[in-house]
């Protein structure tokens, strides 16, 4: 049950994360005009990965797409690429994870196959989340660099009297959406990987062998060095690690190095 819950939650968290990454990528507010000393502005500028917009005091908004590829900064192209890779990986991960969900039965799919698919989708979510976080962070770094550069030459004199006010840009809403979404996708991926461990049928290289002593039998289990008295169900030659499918409600106790008597 815990495995199913972890897997299901991982899927939902990743789904929300990827939706957020898509939303952030499409948003126009990656950078917004810095309203330093001027909270009310007649013309408000903001920019996204695909277009830049201007909103006037009337509410009239005009957006212009970046209709060039070669003319754009390499960093912007890199951010676009990272976000798209993140979306593609996330989408594939979602597709894979749907089939991997324990609560969904597809033909006679083995648990081992579901475990592998869960792990695959988990890794994809992790990489997707990292791509989004990296993309947003690169853009944020670019903004910080440009911000201080434009602050240094805020007013560039032109012929003494005339001044050109440089528009400074600061973090837009899309950056925060991207960071949160990337984090959620990453967390979802980790949860899927954790769920995979619970799904995977554990196999040992050894069969458990019972050594029959003259008095009463003691079964030595190679996995965990845990002695068991011969009374009860463990007196037969029985594999301690059952390779068969477990029910999802089964509480599995794995031997560990601390499990000794």
């Amino acid at each position: 049950m815990a495995v199913t819950a972890c897997q299901g939650l991982g899927f939902v968290v990743s789904l929300i994360g990827i939706a957020g990454i898509i939303a952030a990528t499409c948003m126009d507010q990656w950078s917004t005009q810095d309203l330093y000393n001027n909270p009310v502005t007649a013309v408000f500028n903001y920019q996204g990965l695909w277009r830049s917009c201007v909103r006037e005091s009337s509410g009239f908004t005009e957006c212009r797409g970046y209709f060039t590829l070669l003319g754009l900064p390499a960093m912007l192209q890199a951010v676009r690429a990272l976000m798209i890779v993140g979306i593609v990986l996330g989408a594939i991960g979602l597709l894979v994870s749907i089939f991997a969900l324990k609560c969904i039965r597809i033909g006679s799919m083995e648990d081992s196959a579901k475990a592998n698919m869960t792990l695959t989708s988990g890794i994809m979510f992790i990489v997707s989340g990292l791509c989004a976080i990296a993309g947003v962070s690169v853009f944020a770094n670019m903004l910080v660099t440009n911000f201080w550069m434009s602050t240094a030459n805020m007013y560039t004199g032109m012929g003494g009297m005339v001044q050109t006010v440089q528009t400074r840009y600061t973090f837009g809403a899309a950056l925060f959406v991207g960071w949160v979404a990337g984090g959620l996708t990453l967390i979802g991926g980790v949860m899927m990987c954790i769920a995979c461990r619970g799904l995977a049928p554990e196999e040992t290289n050894y069969k458990a062998v019972s050594y029959h002593a003259s008095g009463h039998s003691v079964a030595y289990k190679p996995g965990g060095f845990k002695a068991s008295t011969g009374f009860g169900s463990n007196t037969k030659n029985k594999k301690i690690y059952d390779g068969g499918a477990r029910t999802e409600d089964e509480v599995q106790s794995y031997p560990s190095k601390h499990d000794y008597v």
């Epitope: 502005t41 212009r64 005339v162």
Partner: antibody, heavy 119, light 113 residues
């Protein structure tokens, strides 16, 4: 058609206050900023400030911040500007103007109220 | 605040003549985001309120005759009347529409001979 109606003239004594009105019609009052502009006799235009009827949010020219107070009455589609502590310097024609949709322009103007401050 | 300087302060021309008037701003009115200049021109006839002629430095308001043309960018702007008519007798004001507080030029008075 868009109309901004203002009373023709107001006569007030120095030190008093006056509330100038501007009744809008022919458009959705709450969708556009309302600006106020002053023109002293034989002089140019000075922007006083603006108010958004929907939100009530205002933006003043620093020069008029302590002099003018902008308000609106949505029910009657009327904008008001209260001028306080009046002196002869405040004698001027006061225009209300609708903020245009494009270019931060002022696209429709009232006829103006001629304010005379005299004892 | 942005200071708007208009020149000349007055102009006397004959009908059907071409006239140009200048407006300079102390700061650039060009917005980098959309490459538009936030300068507006108004016409004020005697005893009337101002009337919007041109916004974005060169876009004519609907109903404004095409003899009125706005041009310029950054800090230097011009209003041209290609063929002056008697009804064009007025004071012409330019206005900074880029940043608050909005500021107006002192006006150019156009007189017809």
């Amino acid at each position: 058609q868009v109309q901004l109606q203002q009373p023709g003239a107001e006569l007030v004594k120095p030190g008093a206050s006056v509330k100038l009105s501007c009744k809008a019609s022919g458009y959705t009052f709450t969708s556009y900023w309302m600006h106020w502009v002053r023109q002293r006799p034989g002089q140019g235009l000075e922007w006083i400030g603006m108010i958004h009827p929907n939100s009530g949010s205002t933006n003043y020219n620093g020069k008029f911040k302590s002099k003018a107070t902008l308000t609106v009455d949505k029910s009657s589609s009327t904008a008001y500007m209260q001028l306080s502590s009046l002196t002869s310097e405040d004698s001027a024609v006061y225009f209300c103007a609708r903020g245009g949709y494009y270019g931060n322009s002022l696209d429709f103007w009232g006829q103006g109220t001629s304010l005379t401050v005299s004892s | 605040d942005i200071v708007m300087t208009q020149s000349p302060s007055s102009l006397t021309v004959t009908a059907r003549e071409k006239v140009t008037m200048s407006c300079k701003s102390s700061q650039s009115l060009l917005n980098s985001g959309n490459q538009k200049n936030y300068l507006t021109w108004y016409q004020q006839k005697p005893g009337q309120p101002p009337k919007l002629l041109i916004y974005w430095a060169s876009t004519r308001e609907s109903g404004v005759p095409d003899r009125f043309t706005g041009s310029g960018s950054g800090t230097d702007f011009t209003l041209t009347i290609s063929s002056v008519q008697a009804e064009d007798l007025a004071v012409y004001y330019c206005q900074n529409a880029y940043s608050y507080p909005f500021t107006f030029g002192s006006g150019t008075k156009l007189e017809i001979k």
